[in-house]
Interface confidence: low
């Protein structure tokens, strides 16, 4: 398809004009930040996003490519290194130790610098970096963290937990040795650490004893608590503030966001991740721009602002089964939910990031039709006379032989939601991928992002915005609008 | 390998610190710019501009990914949206059009708007689109292209050529039908349609009649001129100017680039594309660092200023053939063409810009250990026990199966400059890809290079930098050093 | 639904051997990793040792190292826990589980069997 008015050069001149007048006009917000906001998309490389941009605006039943997302909008753009300390292509435990902490870690330990061993309960004393959360928190902010995967996972846990092994969810998971050396599970953490305002995602089960049934599936032992030490963490959580509620449903959560006695809210809305957004059952679970929208009502109330971290979470299991669909249809959301906290917020007071903890190789390839879907088959064949899909995967579970040949692929199986596209290396899961990331930046100080940056660096933007640890002394004016 | 000093969280906030310090220090340059100089890597995605990154780091004996590339240390980044009008994923011709023109065309077309229509002469006439060398001519700058590609070629081509199929290098490619309704061959255009001061790459046997031999391969028939026209361009073009030089040869380029009496130069220093970096021989053929010296050598002694492109054009060939050895030593000497230029210029007057036209379906995978070599395995075998590469392809030449099973791979194997890394789908050519790609941007107007962009936004922030049309009325104050 | 049934448990004395089973029915053994754990009266729960499907990787706790071997027998869709040199204090009661392993997940075990009573006297 070639859209008439595409075909103009004044449309394109006089786009630029526009483009060109707007950046012209763009004034660093040069106050401090009140509030801080961080969206991270898992795995969410630049790939990732253009393809979604295209699935989007084939939603909104545009050609695509043309039609920005809300992240598009944000003024500044800068590169994110994401390697770790011990390995050129990062998790997601480390990279969150970067984004979060602002010091590199290694591979699979969280909230702990490079001199931490991963499983080695004894390297994590004396080895804990603080996150920009924590900081918010003492001075006086309220802070939340948001995520469609469990809340106790190594993104969201890089906010307030400190662990060498990112996979200790609960007790159940860990080594008796650990246990016994005074090493404690992530769900622990969440509670104990530090005082979390609103805490809303998935991963019931590791709040609960072992063999506690599930309210929503009491019939599914696979989903029953885990806690080996025989606690019950919600309520004990519940217990350090007159003010807590525990919710684990979307009627639940809605009432809780309006209800002015609630001070603090823990919502849990599935025992393990919450489910993809295609899979979302609306009566029952929130979506990640409803959880958003609940966390900011609450955090708002705060006069001295907030820190808010907001993860598109399974974004990247989308990508590690090597399902496209599953991997942009939740990107789409997570871009709905950044839409939604511009709707809520200012740019005069609020710094708003958007990043991605790393990438995946997935790319989007061939040389499709302008207006063609964003699963759909490449035109031509490829040299086995087969069809072939524009979205690939370096490696992961889409390999497949066939009779000892690659499978042929028709329009209607490549749309499919099931759907795995073929890669060139046959893995149980997709792997992440090593380049950089894109920073998308908004609000006070958000000209700081720029160039070509350590993920590292993302924190200390966000500390220096809203003058906390190690930058109280960061001589900005205050926030719009504040009265000191 | 984890390097101590990484181990120390101290390490990550000095580190961190002075990058805010720098942010902070960054002052736009709002003069207007004398110099104009565009970079464009062929198929240089964010992807390859990671490898390379690490490639160069670890040439310098570091462990490379923390170790900037030249334009890495550009102040200002954004991400381009390279569709074309008829496709999502575009080619090096309607790209060259969008960067240099500031309109996006269609594939396969250079110079036109995109009412022109692939291989169909009469859709030429009225659809030309005028790039910025053009303009910057017409102000009285100097102005040259470099490539490492034949200076026919599509990207190069877009500076100065209007057709509406990028392959009519010389008439000999041309229908006869197009011929007689008028259109013009590339190499043609290349010497009529403007004053080019520098021209620089490959493309000997394009200017010269059909047969007539090759000074550097007399004997290879398949080198010989191809014109059928039976005109010498080199000769037409050199009658054209007292001061004009032409050259085929590294020491001609030397000498003729220290000649104060040489006003215009043209060195054509291979018949078709110039060598791979690794195949040159450095007595023979320049480098691209070589060129880019020489072109900014002559084009600097205009009082005016200049606009240079240089395309590091053979990145794209690399990724095309599966053979990534080739498209990152091809990307590390682009870099460090990149470096060079910015010894011999001032960011005071000259806006330098570093992008790419696309992307590549090009991944770096896997979970490899930090200084591992980024031709090297992955950590593990794949699910068929056999090892396999980070590095891998979408699709393209680099899918084999042998004996009805994916091929195992050594790390000697994968190391070669031969070796084709596997793919997802067979195809005789490795495909482009359509993800944003980065635009790095220093000196004056860089600050206008900013957030999610239209890759035709590029050719409009030279043309406003430099007063050119249709920013004539720029109001900006004379650049840095020039008295009006 | 996956069913998992421990057998194989008893009286022993110190120093001696026993071999507990661990039957999977349901779904194919091979689309999981085994995990043994074990609970002593009034103490928590906590991992012996776990062993992927595909045999790639296999891990012990630090207290039955050398002493105790995990096995898979495909065709039987069976585990094994092989244990040898007992110890008094490795008196339990023994669970089987399957479950997946991702990066995305880690070690996460979805079903668990009933338990079998382990008894080292002296």
């Known amino acids: 398809i070639i859209p008439v008015e595409e075909e103009n050069p004044d449309f394109w001149n006089r786009q630029a004009a526009e483009a060109l007048g707007a950046a012209k006009k763009l004034q660093p917000i040069q106050t401090a930040a009140k509030n801080l906001i961080i969206f991270l998309g898992d795995g969410m490389g630049v790939s990732t996003v253009t393809a979604a941009r295209i699935l989007k605006g084939q939603k909104e039943e545009k050609l695509g490519p043309e039609t920005p997302l809300a992240m598009d909008h944000f003024p500044y753009v800068a590169l994110s290194k994401t390697y770790s300390v011990d390995k050129h292509v990062p998790d997601s435990a480390a990279t969150a130790t970067a984004y979060l902490c602002g010091v590199k870690g290694n591979f699979q330990t969280i909230g702990l610098s490079a001199a931490a061993r991963y499983n080695q309960c004894n390297t994590t004393r004396g080895n804990e970096v603080v996150s920009v959360m924590n900081r918010a928190k003492k001075a006086g902010k309220s802070v939340g963290v948001v995520t469609t995967t469990r809340v106790q996972h190594a993104s969201p846990a890089g906010a307030y937990a400190h662990t060498v092994n990112r996979n200790w969810y609960s007790d159940a998971n860990m080594p008796g040795s650990a246990r016994r050396e005074g090493c404690k599970d992530i769900a622990t953490q969440l509670i104990s650490n530090m005082d979390i305002d609103v805490i809303l995602g998935g991963g019931r089960k590791y709040m609960f004893r072992m063999g506690a049934p599930d309210p929503e599936y009491p019939h599914d032992y696979s989903q029953d608590g885990t806690r080996m030490d025989g606690k019950n963490l919600v309520q004990e959580w519940l217990a350090k503030h007159q003010g807590a509620r525990y919710v684990w449903n979307r009627t639940e959560l809605m009432q809780a966001s309006l209800d002015p006695s609630v001070t603090h809210l823990m919502g849990l809305f599935e025992p393990g991740d919450m489910k993809y957004e295609i899979h979302r059952d609306p009566t029952l679970d929130p979506s990640l721009m409803e959880m958003t929208e609940a966390a900011l009502r609450l955090l708002s109330r705060n006069p001295r602002g907030f820190f808010l971290f907001v993860e598109g979470g399974r974004i990247d299991h989308g990508h590690h089964e090597s399902r496209a669909y599953r991997a942009l249809t939740e990107a789409v959301m997570f871009d709905d939910a950044i839409e939604r906290a511009g709707q809520l917020t200012s740019e005069e007071d609020t710094l708003t990031l958007v990043t991605a903890d790393h990438s995946h190789v997935f790319s989007f390839g061939a040389y499709p039709l302008r207006g063609s879907s964003i699963f759909g088959l490449a035109p031509g064949k490829a040299q086995d006379r087969k069809a072939y899909t524009a979205l690939l995967y370096g490696n992961g579970p889409g390999y497949v032989l066939k009779d000892g040949a690659r499978p042929d692929v028709t329009e209607s199986e490549s749309g499919s939601p099931e759907y795995r596209q073929q890669a060139a290396v046959p893995l149980d899961e997709e792997t992440h991928a090593g380049e950089d990331v894109a920073v998308f930046a908004r609000g006070p100080q958000a000209h700081l992002v720029h160039g070509v940056q350590e993920q590292s660096f993302v924190a200390h933007v966000m500390a220096f915005a809203a003058c906390l640890e190690p930058y109280t002394a960061c001589d900005l004016a205050p926030p719009a609008g504040t009265t000191d | 390998i984890i390097p101590v000093e990484e181990e120390n969280p101290d390490f990550w906030n000095r580190q961190a610190a002075e990058a805010l310090g720098a942010a902070k220090k960054l002052q736009p340059i709002q003069t207007a710019a004398k110099n104009l100089i565009i970079f464009l890597g062929d198929g240089m995605g964010v992807s390859t501009v990671t490898a390379a990154r690490i490639l160069k780091g670890q040439k310098e004996e570091k462990l490379g990914p923390e170790t900037p590339l030249a334009m890495d240390h550009f102040p200002y980044v954004a991400l381009s949206k390279t569709y074309s009008v008829d496709k999502h994923v575009p080619d090096s011709a309607a790209t060259a059009t969008a960067y240099l023109c500031g309109v996006k065309g269609n594939f396969q077309t250079i110079g036109l708007s995109a009412a022109a229509r692939y291989n169909q002469c009469n859709t030429t006439r009225g659809n030309e689109v005028v790039s910025v060398m053009n303009r910057a001519k017409k102000a009285g700058k100097s102005v040259g292209v470099v490539t490492t590609t034949r200076v026919q070629h599509a990207s190069p081509a877009g500076a100065y050529a209007h057709t509406v199929n990028r392959n009519w290098y010389s008439d000999a490619n041309m229908p006869g039908s197009a011929r007689r309704e008028g259109c013009k061959d590339i190499a043609t255009q290349l010497i009529s349609n403007m004053d080019i001061d520098v021209i620089l790459g490959g493309g000997r046997k394009y200017m010269f009649r059909m047969g007539a031999p090759d000074p550097e391969y007399p004997h290879d028939y398949s080198q010989d001129g191809t014109r059928m026209d039976g005109k010498n361009l080199v000769q037409e073009w050199l009658a054209k100017h007292q001061g004009a030089r032409y050259v085929w040869n590294r020491t001609e380029l030397m000498q003729a680039s220290l000649d104060p009496s040489v006003t215009h130069l043209m060195g054509l220093f291979e018949p078709g594309d110039m060598k791979y970096e690794i195949h040159r021989d450095p007595t023979l053929d320049p480098s691209l660092m070589e060129m880019t010296e020489a072109a900014l050598r002559l084009l600097s002694r205009n009082p005016r200023g200049f606009f240079l492109f240089v395309e590091g054009g053979r990145i794209d060939h690399g990724h095309h053939e599966s053979r990534a050895y080739r498209a990152l030593t091809e990307a590390v000497m682009f870099d460090d063409a990149i470096e060079r230029a910015g010894q011999l210029t001032s960011e005071e007057d000259t806006l330098t810009l570093v992008t790419a036209d696309h992307s590549h379906v090009f991944s770096f995978g896997a979970y490899p250990l930090r200084g591992s070599s980024i031709f090297g395995l992955a950590p593990g075998k794949a699910q068929d026990r056999k090892a396999y590469t980070a590095l891998l392809y979408g699709n393209g030449p680099g899918y084999v199966l042998k004996d009805g099973a994916r091929p195992d791979v050594t790390e000697s194997e994968s190391g070669s400059p031969e070796y084709r890394q596997q793919a997802a789908v067979p195809l005789d050519e490795e495909t482009h890809a359509g993800e944003d790609v980065a635009v790095f941007a220093r000196g004056p107007q860089a600050h206008l290079v900013h957030g999610v962009q239209e890759q035709s936004f590029v050719a409009h922030v030279m043309a406003f930098a430099a007063c050119l049309e249709p920013y004539t009325a720029c109001d900006l104050a004379p650049p840095a050093g020039t008295t009006d | 639904q996956v069913q998992l049934v421990e057998s194989g448990g008893g009286l022993v004395q110190a120093g001696g051997s026993l071999r507990l089973s661990c039957a999977v029915s349901?779904?194919?053994?091979?689309?999981?990793?085994i995990g043994w754990f074990r609970q002593a009266p009034g103490k928590e729960r906590e991992f012996v040792a776990r062993?992927?499907?595909?045999?790639?990787?296999?891990r012990y706790d630090d207290s039955v190292k050398g002493r105790f071997t995990v096995s898979i027998e495909d065709a039987k869709n069976t585990a094994y826990l092989q244990m040898s040199s007992l110890k008094t204090e490795d008196t339990a009661v023994y669970y089987c589980?399957?479950?997946?392993?991702?990066?995305?997940?880690?070690?996460?075990?979805?079903?668990w069997g009933q338990g079998t009573q382990v008894t080292v006297s002296s």
């Open positions: 589980a399957a479950g997946r392993y991702s990066r995305a997940r880690g070690w996460e075990y979805d079903y």
């Open positions: 062993k992927t499907w595909d045999g790639s990787s296999t």
């Open positions: 349901g779904r194919a053994l091979s689309d999981y990793n």
